[in-house]
């Protein structure tokens, strides 16, 4: 009864196609697969950024896999060959691991890389990123931003930099077609005649950094003697109504402050006949149904009612 053995995959490597963190892991079939002609071997691939506690695990019949990584750190990966149950009478047969690593040799000291990188996708339309120069870098230092997402043939450089004192401190992006709900990769590198500059890599998804416009057309409607309905409209732009959460601040007679978070463009407020003045403001944010995170809009213009008209049916301003 001969022991079944299988070799690890050959030529296991991590290839960087220049997509700022989206890497290819590829390998060749193991030697001596002839004994297993009736079996479809599978490969168990494990990979992670160095320093991460957990491995990502994939099982595939293919000879390649692609995923995104943080190029600020190194990458380690390992792979072995698995034989399916049908070929092994139920016992596990797997090869030894083939292992590989990848990292970008860092230039410059960490302090030279950009500081406080901040990116906002305004109203799900306009992406703007800003940063501060590295610590202790000279004025001759300039930073360049490159970006890539799936759908672009290659990484692109920013063409509309925001400048301060002749230095690039931000980027206004062009229209980014079909760029949400996928990883968006950025590299900010730099050059200086004085000393090498450390590159920085960032990855995010655009729908998670949206800052909407504030709601518009705030109105009051008297529903009953003790209820007033506050209404507003979604801001102009591409964000559908189903994607919004709202926060309202209501001030009654300069004293009572009510805050509430709602999912619709209305809020019903209990009032008394003694109420002489009512003001409210609203702000919006993309909700959990459309993103994992978001940024609150600015507050809307304040809408107020003053005087006797609160007993009337509709109050518009």
């Amino acid at each position: 009864d001969t022991e079944i053995k299988v070799n690890p995959p050959q030529d296991f490597e991590i290839v960087d196609p220049g997509y700022l963190g989206y890497l290819y892991l590829q390998w060749q079939p193991p030697l001596s697969l002839d004994h297993f002609k009736e079996c479809t071997v599978e490969y168990e691939l494990k990979y992670r950024n160095i320093g991460s506690e957990t491995w990502k695990t994939i099982i595939t019949k293919n000879l390649h896999y692609k995923d995104g990584f943080d190029l600020n750190k190194g990458i380690e990966a390992k792979i072995h060959t698995l034989l399916p149950w049908q070929c092994t009478n139920g016992s596990e047969v797997q090869s030894s691991w083939a292992e590989t690593t990848y990292w970008i040799s860092p230039q410059g000291i960490p302090e030279t890389k950009v500081q406080d990188m901040d990116c906002v996708y305004y109203n799900w339309q306009y992406l703007l990123c800003s940063w501060k120069p590295g610590i202790g870098v000279l004025l001759d230092t300039n930073y360049n931003l490159f970006y890539w997402y799936e759908g672009l043939d290659h990484a692109l450089q920013c063409v509309d930099y925001i400048k301060a004192d002749g230095q690039n401190i931000g980027c206004r992006f062009p229209y980014l077609e079909a760029s949400d709900y996928k990883d968006f990769y950025i590299c900010v590198n730099g050059s200086s005649e004085n000393k090498p500059i450390r590159s920085s890599y960032f990855t995010f998804q655009l729908q998670n950094i949206v800052k909407p416009l504030p709601p518009v057309y705030l109105t009051f409607t008297r529903e009953s003697s003790c209820e007033i309905k506050l209404k507003w409209s979604i801001p102009l732009g591409p964000i559908p109504a189903r994607c919004f959460d709202y926060e309202i601040e209501i001030r009654e007679d300069d004293t009572t402050l009510v805050t509430a978070t709602v999912e619709n463009e209305t809020y019903t407020l209990k009032t008394t006949n003694e109420t002489r003045q009512l003001c409210f403001v609203v702000r919006s944010k993309v909700n959990i149904y459309c993103s994992d995170d978001g940024i609150w809009s600015e507050w809307s213009d304040k809408q107020c009612w003053e005087g006797e008209d609160l007993s009337k049916k509709t109050l518009l301003r």
Partner: nanobody
Framework: QVKLEESGGGSVQAGGSLKLSCAAS????????MGWFRRALREERELVAE???????TYDDSVKGRFTISRDNVKNTVYLQMNNLKTEDTAVYYC?????????WGQGTQVTVSS
């Protein structure tokens, strides 16, 4: 006949819950590690959670704190309790026997999470 059979998939709103089951038959279930994998748009199956024959569990970072794997060696069944589901959890979910047993796949069960 050696077999793994998943059940419990379905459609759910984002934020909802589902519990998947995988019944094993035809082999000594208790000695095998078991895993839940999923396949979305890609051909590859990614490990979601696994449980060794001694009950040790590991989870992919994307599901930590939301999914729980468990096993019942009397019923020869492994479970995946999925809470706070997200649209990106939409996939076909497969259970698989793991080491020290050979690799054996179930047929899969579809999970669809809509916003």
């Amino acid at each position: 006949q050696v077999k793994l059979e998943e059940s419990g998939g379905g459609s759910v709103q984002a934020g909802g819950s589902l519990k998947l089951s995988c019944a094993a038959s035809g082999y000594n279930f208790s000695k095998c590690g078991m895993g839940w994998f999923r396949r979305a748009l890609r051909e590859e199956r990614e490990l979601v959670a696994e449980i060794s024959n001694d009950g040790t569990t590991t989870y992919d970072d994307s599901v930590k704190g939301r999914f729980t794997i468990s096993r019942d060696n009397v019923k020869n069944t492994v479970y995946l309790q999925m809470n706070n589901l997200k649209t990106e959890d939409t996939a076909v979910y497969y259970c698989a026997s793991r080491n020290p047993c050979g690799l054996l796949w179930g047929q899969g069960t579809q999970v669809t999470v809509s916003s």
